[in-house]
């Protein structure tokens, strides 16, 4: 990546990080408005499996692993980027090395949700808080789950399907902050690990994934009022590890695996047209990403 | 029947390539992570390379990171280790294995045959 | 690299006897341990999973214990089929490891 300044520009999609041979170190960000790419400061260590969210308008990259052929190392790092220097700047550590981790942001902090350190798949959550440079554990969540779909929806936290070392799952639970507990919600209809998942109006969506045999490109979709998963419209493509953000009222998803290739695509699904339809593609193919959306 | 069965080794010398395949049956490859496992003449196993199949990322020993390349064909339902400069200590019968979660936790429950490579000049 | 060390490299014994193989890893691989019998011109089989899980299809008379980063394979009471080598393998961090191996001997 370049290391000059970049463009004060409004709304990017950010994408950083993933795997193709081996993990990455870009930092990529796409312009919906005119379809350019920007290259951008590379993060100090490359990682795949990593979650990616914004906090105050700077960029955040939390967990996942460096697998290079020197070897293999999960991350508890949480790195800091700020698109006005175009410079990135390590925070505290989680308190365990997270790989295909999960994240969300409620009122300004970041929860880190669930991933794996080595064998070890954590059902352990944690919180950051930014002004405090300091993490804290939150109650664990009920089931261990990587690979698992986070999405903040009215404050409350969602972890949606991935993987429990034994079984990918269809299960879903979502956090109270308030009384710091977890709940079962409604299973979704497919099982899901590695699948994106955000929230565009009122709804969580959860799109592709692994289901323990293939890829899927399905997407389904729970109504907090009516406590159901409906399908809508499946992806163009099949893919599971993929990114996914939300942008001007529509869902972005991001390369991924589909079995076979790693993915450069890039879809966006508009809700009033119940449709899909490629809008890019990335520089290189790639899965295991970490994406978000600068605020305006 | 769950089945691997392993292809494509035979005698090379230093310095060449030799791409093994790894063919199955009774199973999907897609649901399973996919590993290479080898055992010198009269000695010991040892873990070569691995793919999941979630994510399509692959792992490897030190010992060939940068000169061995995993993957999979889930339409032909076969893995491959494409091996390139080898070196007399290469020298082995190399086993395709699986390991399905739901079975048995990331150990390999089922194993191919093996397929004798041999690096000489 | 995790070291798992086997012990003892070989053993003999006689149909009937009860068998002790022992794994020791260099640091903590939590219950990630497998154990593999082998015979000779042939691939290895999954005997154990999770230190003391029994495979499916695996004789009642193998069994798997761990007691903190020892793992221990234990044949209750050794069958003529069981003249073998066996491995352990360590799945819980890159790389995978797997012990030397124990030959089996008869007495």
């Known amino acids: 990546g370049s290391m000059g300044h970049a463009p004060k520009v409004g709304r990017l999609i950010y994408t950083a990080g993933g795997y193709f041979r081996q993990s990455l170190s870009y930092l990529e960000a796409y312009n919906p408005s005119d379809g350019t790419w920007l290259d951008l400061a590379d993060l100090q260590v490359p990682r795949s499996g990593l979650a990616g969210c914004v906090v105050g308008g700077l960029l955040y990259a939390v967990g996942g692993r460096n697998n290079s052929p020197d070897g293999n190392t999960d991350s508890s790092a949480l790195d800091c980027y700020n698109p006005m220097t175009n410079q990135w700047s390590p925070c505290a550590p989680m308190s365990v090395p997270r790989n295909r981790i999960g994240v969300g942001v409620i009122d300004g902090h970041i929860y880190a949700v669930g991933g794996s350190h080595g064998c070890i798949h954590h059902n352990s959550v944690e919180r950051y808080e930014p002004e405090r440079d300091e993490w804290h554990l939150v109650a664990p969540m009920l089931t261990r789950r990587i690979g698992v779909g986070v999405a903040v929806l009215n404050r409350l936290l969602y972890a949606v399907g991935g993987f429990d070392g034994t079984n990918r799952l269809n299960s879903a639970e979502c956090y109270y902050p308030e009384r710091n507990e977890w709940r079962m919600i409604t299973a979704m209809n497919t099982i899901r690990s590695g699948a994106g998942v955000c929230v565009l109006h009122n709804c969580i969506y959860a799109a592709g994934g692994y289901d323990g045999q293939d890829q899927l490109n399905s997407v389904e979709r729970y109504d907090v009022e009516t406590e159901t998963w409906t399908f809508v419209a499946p992806m163009k493509h099949r893919r599971s590890a993929l990114g996914i953000t939300v942008h001007q009222g529509r869902i972005y998803v991001l390369g991924g695996y589909d079995g076979h290739t790693f993915l450069d695509s890039v879809e966006c699904y508009d809700p009033d047209t119940d449709t899909w339809s490629e809008v890019t593609r990335m520089t290189s193919g790639r899965s295991g990403v970490g994406v978000a959306v600068t605020m305006e | 029947e769950v089945q691997l069965v392993e292809s494509g080794g035979g005698l090379v010398q230093p310095g060449g390539s030799l791409r093994l395949s790894c063919a199955a049956s009774g199973f999907a490859i897609s649901a399973s992570s996919i590993h290479w496992v080898r055992q010198a003449p009269g000695k010991g196993l040892e873990w070569v390379a691995s793919i999941d199949p979630e994510t399509g990322e692959t792992l490897y020993a030190k010992s060939v990171a940068g000169r061995f390349t995993i993957s999979a064909d889930t339409s032909k339902n076969t893995a491959y280790l494409q091996m390139n400069s080898l070196r007399a200590e290469d020298t082995a019968v190399y086993y395709c294995a699986r390991s399905a979660a739901s079975d048995a936790a990331y150990a390999a429950n089922v194993w191919g045959q093996g397929t004798l490579v041999t690096v000489s000049s | 690299d995790i070291q798992m060390t086997q012990s003892p490299s070989s053993l003999s014994a006689s149909v009937g006897d009860r068998v002790t193989i022992t794994c020791r890893a260099s640091q903590s691989v939590s219950s990630a341990v497998a154990w593999y019998q082998q015979k000779p011109g042939k691939a290895p089989k999954l005997l154990i999973y999770s230190a003391s899980s029994l495979y499916s299809g695996v004789p009642s008379r193998f069994s798997g214990s761990r007691s903190g980063t020892d793992f221990t394979l234990t044949i209750s009471s050794l069958q003529p089929e069981d003249f073998a080598t066996y491995y352990c393998?360590?799945?819980?961090?890159?790389?995978?490891?797997f012990g030397q191996g124990t030959k089996v001997e008869i007495k």
């Open positions: 393998q360590q799945s819980y961090s890159f790389p995978s490891t």
